[in-house]
């Protein structure tokens, strides 16, 4: 039994890091493998993560972590019974994938303005709370070409757009994702999308 693709890990910088790897053949990850991990400076016995299958030869493990700080470094040992298959380390702050924003809501009752709001996925005491910026994707269900991205580079989790920038009388969907420049993170997954019917009063034309 050998590791074909070494474990790579990403952290949500809060409580979970996810490690994925591939074996050289079909493997029952949960019965055959164990990923041991420990925060180096604690000098205590490692914790055990039981991996799950992720495709025939792929495995994934969700490492439970505590609050993360930038200096944290974890040791990782991948075992098959008594055989050490791979040894490595992981610094969560260097491999951050933020949590997806939640509770995306479209408020349509504000005088021809669309107000989109969502929730920051981190608690205020987490470092990323004040460092997230967002991308909002709005698209038409009727017209695949009507697809737009709005970059929200301020901290407030909201976006205002004029309803008239979208077509009237049709349905739109929106979703939002986050990233943090400070840690050069990857983008989060998209939030669940939300749907609304866009309608606004055309301005009265005077002749």
């Amino acid at each position: 039994m050998k590791v074909l693709q070494e474990p790579t890990c990403v952290s949500d910088y809060m409580s979970i890091s996810t490690c994925e790897w591939k074996m050289n053949g079909p493997t029952n990850c949960s019965t055959e493998l164990r990923l041991l991990y420990q925060l180096v400076f604690l000098l205590s016995e490692a914790h055990t993560c039981i991996p799950e299958n992720n495709g025939g030869a792929g495995c994934v493990c969700h490492l439970l972590m505590d609050d993360v700080v930038s200096a944290d470094n974890y040791t990782l040992d991948l075992w098959a019974g008594q055989q050490l298959l791979w040894k490595g380390s992981f610094k969560p702050s260097e491999h951050v994938k933020p949590r997806a924003p939640g509770n995306l809501t479209v408020h349509t009752n504000v005088s021809d303005t669309l107000l989109l709001t969502w929730s920051n996925p981190y608690p205020p005491d987490n470092y990323l709370y004040n460092h997230l910026t967002y991308a909002v994707n709005i698209w038409s269900e009727n017209d695949p070409a009507d697809f737009r991205i709005y970059n929200v580079t301020y901290l407030e989790p909201s976006l205002r757009i004029a309803a008239s920038t979208l077509k009237s009388g049709i349905s739109y969907r929106a979703r939002v994702r986050a990233w943090a420049q400070c840690y050069n993170t990857t983008w989060s997954e998209w939030s669940p999308s939300t749907k609304w019917h866009n309608s606004y009063r055309e301005p009265f034309e005077q002749h």
Epitope: L42, S44, S70
Partner: antibody, heavy 119, light 107 residues
Framework: QVQLVESGGGVVQPGRSLRLSCAAS????????MHWVRQAPGKGLEWVAV????????YYADSVKGRFTISRDNSKNTLYLQMNSLRAEDTAVYYC????????????WGQGTLVTVSS | EIVMTQSPSSLSASLGDRVTITCRAS??????LAWYQQKPGKAPKLLIY???SLESGVPSRFSGSGSGTEFTLTISSLQPDDFATYYC?????????FGQGTKLEIK
């Protein structure tokens, strides 16, 4: 419940040696790093040394490096501090403390043993 | 080494007073901070761990807050048993470090 009981303190002359022990119970001793912390009379708390769960890694405060040795016997659930070349400034109450397996854990300390270095 | 700066070093207060002690870390330690109470001749007693978690059996008038580099211990209403010395401690490295202590005295 977690219990840590220090022993081995006493009065010793400068330059002499002393060995402190810490008997642990109520938890899986072999899973935890263990620390020594001291407090000179009327002063604050000072970290002294730590040993990893399996004894493979040891770290010391600069003030005791080269003179003190931390060790453990996991079969006896006991932590030790061998103190050589003792100085007057080593006079303190010495506490053993359990480390953490997660930074969300609770820290436990013993009641301490007094070491007096005096001629 | 992570340096912990605690203030004030001493404090006089009256029964029923609200008291706040602060602790500043020289670098980000997340929430890896504990607060202890110590009385003469006794071992330090853990009050707060993980910056804001109240240790079992500790009265709810004690509370901790903060994360990163700035932390506070608050006693909402001083009781006779609270006059003691208080220490903060970081455990964000294998070498623990402590604040210098705050001696809380009766006014």
């Amino acid at each position: 419940q977690v219990q840590l009981v220090e022993s081995g303190g006493g009065v010793v002359q400068p330059g002499r040696s002393l060995r402190l022990s810490c008997a642990a119970s109520g938890f899986t001793f072999s899973s935890y790093a263990m620390h020594w912390v001291r407090q000179a009379p009327g002063k604050g708390l000072e970290w002294v040394a730590v040993i990893s769960y399996d004894g493979s890694n040891k770290y010391y405060a600069d003030s005791v490096k080269g003179r003190f040795t931390i060790s453990r016997d996991n079969s006896k659930n006991t932590l030790y501090l061998q103190m050589n070349s003792l100085r007057a400034e080593d006079t303190a109450v010495y506490y053993c403390a359990r480390g953490l397996t997660t930074v969300r854990g609770v820290l436990y300390w013993g009641q301490g043993t007094l070491v007096t270095v005096s001629s | 080494e992570i340096v912990m700066t605690q203030s004030p070093s001493s404090l006089s207060a009256s029964l029923g007073d609200r008291v706040t002690i602060t602790c500043r870390a020289s670098q980000n330690i997340g929430s890896r901070l504990a607060w202890y109470q110590q009385k003469p001749g006794k071992a330090p007693k853990l009050l707060i761990y993980k910056a804001s978690s109240l240790e079992s059996g500790v009265p709810s008038r004690f509370s901790g807050s903060g994360s990163g580099t700035e932390f506070t211990l608050t006693i909402s209403s001083l009781q006779p048993d609270d006059f003691a010395t208080y220490y903060c401690q970081q455990y964000n490295s294998y070498s623990w470090t402590f604040g210098q202590g705050t001696k809380l005295e009766i006014k």
